[in-house]
C-alpha cells in the first residue's frame, strides 16, 4: 500500500512539476526592467526565451519575437535547449510512469517490469528537474552578469549621441516558477525511485538456521536446506531435516519415517 502511495504521489508531483516547466518555458516574464518613468505613465520591459514585450501602466502591451538566431546570446540558446530537454525527458517519463503505476493493470505485466519502468521514469524525472533548475539558474546568472557589465556610458553614434540608461533588472516570475517546478520534478523522480525498491520482487532470502542433532553421531543430508523460488510446495524456506544417522550410501535413498517437511 505504501509503495502504491509513494509511486502515485511521485507521479502526481512530477506531473505538476513538468506542467510548471512547460509553463515557465512559455512565459514571457523571465526578466523585467523599468524603461521609463514619469508622473503620467511607467513603461517596463519583460523578456522571455522566445519574445520580448513592452508594457505600459495604461495596459498597452507590444511584443516582438526573436526571429533571428544569430543575434541572440549563446546563453539564451543554452537555456532554451536545457528547458526543451527537460520537457522532452519529463514527457517521456510521464508516459513510461503511467504504464508503471501499480494501480493500473496492463495485460499480464510482471512486477519486475513495472519496477524497471518506475525506476526509468524516476531517473528521467530527476534529469528533467535538474535540466530545468540548471536552465533557470544559468539565465539568472546571465541577468546578474549583464546588469553589472552595463555601466552607464555615453558615446557618439550615428547622427547624434547615444546614452546607455542604467536600469534595474529584476528576476521575472518565470524564474521562480522554473525553480519550483524543477524542484517538484526532482522530488517526484526521487519518490518514483524509492517506490521502485518496494515494487521489485523480493530476492531469495537465505536465512541462517540452527540445526540440533538428536544423537551423538549425526550426519546431515546434503542439500537438506532448500532455497525457495516462490513456487512449489516449499514456499516458506522450511527446514528439510533428518534427525537420524545415515551411512554415506543411504543418503540417496527414499525418505524414511524420520524425514519431515
Amino acid at each position: 500500500m505504501a509503495v502504491t502511495a509513494c509511486q502515485g504521489l511521485g507521479f502526481v508531483v512530477s506531473l505538476i512539476g513538468i506542467a510548471g516547466i512547460i509553463a515557465a518555458t512559455c512565459m514571457d516574464q523571465w526578466s523585467t526592467q523599468d524603461l521609463y518613468n514619469n508622473p503620467v505613465t511607467a513603461v517596463f520591459n519583460y523578456q522571455g526565451l522566445w519574445r520580448s514585450c513592452v508594457r505600459e501602466s495604461s495596459g498597452f502591451t507590444e511584443c516582438r519575437g526573436y526571429f533571428t538566431l544569430l543575434g541572440l546570446p549563446a546563453m539564451l540558446q543554452a537555456v532554451r535547449a536545457l528547458m526543451i530537454v527537460g520537457i522532452v525527458l519529463g514527457a517521456i517519463g510521464l508516459l513510461v510512469s503511467i504504464f508503471a503505476l501499480k494501480c493500473i493493470r496492463i495485460g499480464s505485466m510482471e512486477d519486475s517490469a513495472k519496477a524497471n519502468m518506475t525506476l526509468t521514469s524516476g531517473i528521467m524525472f530527476i534529469v528533467s528537474g535538474l535540466c530545468a533548475i540548471a536552465g533557470v539558474s544559468v539565465f539568472a546568472n546571465m541577468l546578474v552578469t549583464n546588469f553589472w557589465m552595463s555601466t552607464a556610458n555615453m558615446y557618439t553614434g550615428m547622427g547624434g549621441m547615444v546614452q546607455t540608461v542604467q536600469t534595474r533588472y529584476t528576476f521575472g516570475a518565470a524564474l521562480f516558477v522554473g525553480w519550483v517546478a524543477g524542484g517538484l520534478t526532482l522530488i517526484g523522480g526521487v519518490m518514483m525511485c524509492i517506490a521502485c525498491r518496494g515494487l521489485a520482487p523480493e530476492e531469495t532470502n537465505y536465512k541462517a538456521v540452527s540445526y540440533h542433532a538428536s544423537g551423538h553421531s549425526v550426519a546431515y543430508k546434503p542439500g537438506g536446506f532448500k532455497a525457495s523460488t516462490g513456487f512449489g510446495s516449499n514456499t516458506k524456506n522450511k527446514k528439510i531435516y533428518d534427525g537420524g544417522a545415515r551411512t554415506e550410501d543411504e543418503v540417496q535413498s527414499y525418505p524414511s519415517k524420520h524425514d519431515y517437511v
Epitope: 526578466s31 526592467q33 524603461l35 521609463y36 503620467v40 505613465t41 513603461v43 520591459n45 523578456q47 520580448s52 513592452v54 505600459e56 501602466s57 495604461s58 495596459g59 498597452f60 507590444e62 516582438r64 526573436y66 543575434g71 541572440l72 546570446p73 539564451l76 546571465m142 541577468l143 549583464n146 552595463s150 553614434g157 550615428m158 547624434g160 549621441m161 547615444v162 546614452q163 546607455t164 540608461v165 542604467q166 536600469t167 533588472y169
Partner: nanobody, 121 residues
Framework: QVKLEESGGGLVQAGGSLRLSCVAS????????MGWYRQAPGKQRELVAT???????HYADSTKGRFSISSDNAKNAVALQMNSLQPDDTAVYFC???????????????WGQGTQVTVSS
C-alpha cells in the same frame, strides 16, 4: 543602432506655429518612448514633451497647452506641433528615442543632431 532624422525647424514670428518631425530607423527590438528635448544657449537640455507607444503623453509645464506631441508607431515617427511660440522657446530641439537594441541588455537613449528653432519678437 538607431538613426534619427529630424526636420521642420526654422525661423518664426512670436505667436506663430511650427511642426517638428522625427523618424527613427535602424535595427532595434523595441522603442519604449519617443520625445523632444530642447537646449537654449548656455542652458541645460530640458524636456519638452514625450509620448509612449501606447500614446501616453507628458509635457513640461512651460509647454503645456501650447505644444502637442503625436506619434506614428508603424513608421516609428514622432511629431511636435508648436503653437503660440514665444521668444523664450528659441533653442535647438532634439529628438529622443529610448530603445532596446539587444535582448537582456539595458535600453539606450538615442539623440538626433538637433534642429534650430528661432522665435523672433
Amino acid at each position: 543602432q538607431v538613426k534619427l532624422e529630424e526636420s521642420g525647424g526654422g525661423l518664426v514670428q512670436a505667436g506663430g506655429s511650427l511642426r517638428l518631425s522625427c523618424v527613427a530607423s535602424g535595427s532595434f527590438l523595441h522603442i519604449a518612448v519617443m520625445g523632444w528635448y530642447r537646449q537654449a544657449p548656455g542652458k541645460q537640455r530640458e524636456l519638452v514633451a514625450t509620448i509612449t507607444r501606447g500614446g501616453a503623453t507628458h509635457y513640461a509645464d512651460s509647454t503645456k497647452g501650447r505644444f502637442s506631441i503625436s506619434s506614428d508607431n508603424a513608421k516609428n515617427a514622432v511629431a511636435l506641433q508648436m503653437n503660440s511660440l514665444q521668444p523664450d522657446d528659441t533653442a535647438v530641439y532634439f529628438c529622443n528615442v529610448r530603445a532596446l537594441i539587444k535582448v537582456f541588455h539595458p535600453p539606450n537613449d538615442y539623440w538626433g543632431q538637433g534642429t534650430q528653432v528661432t522665435v523672433s519678437s
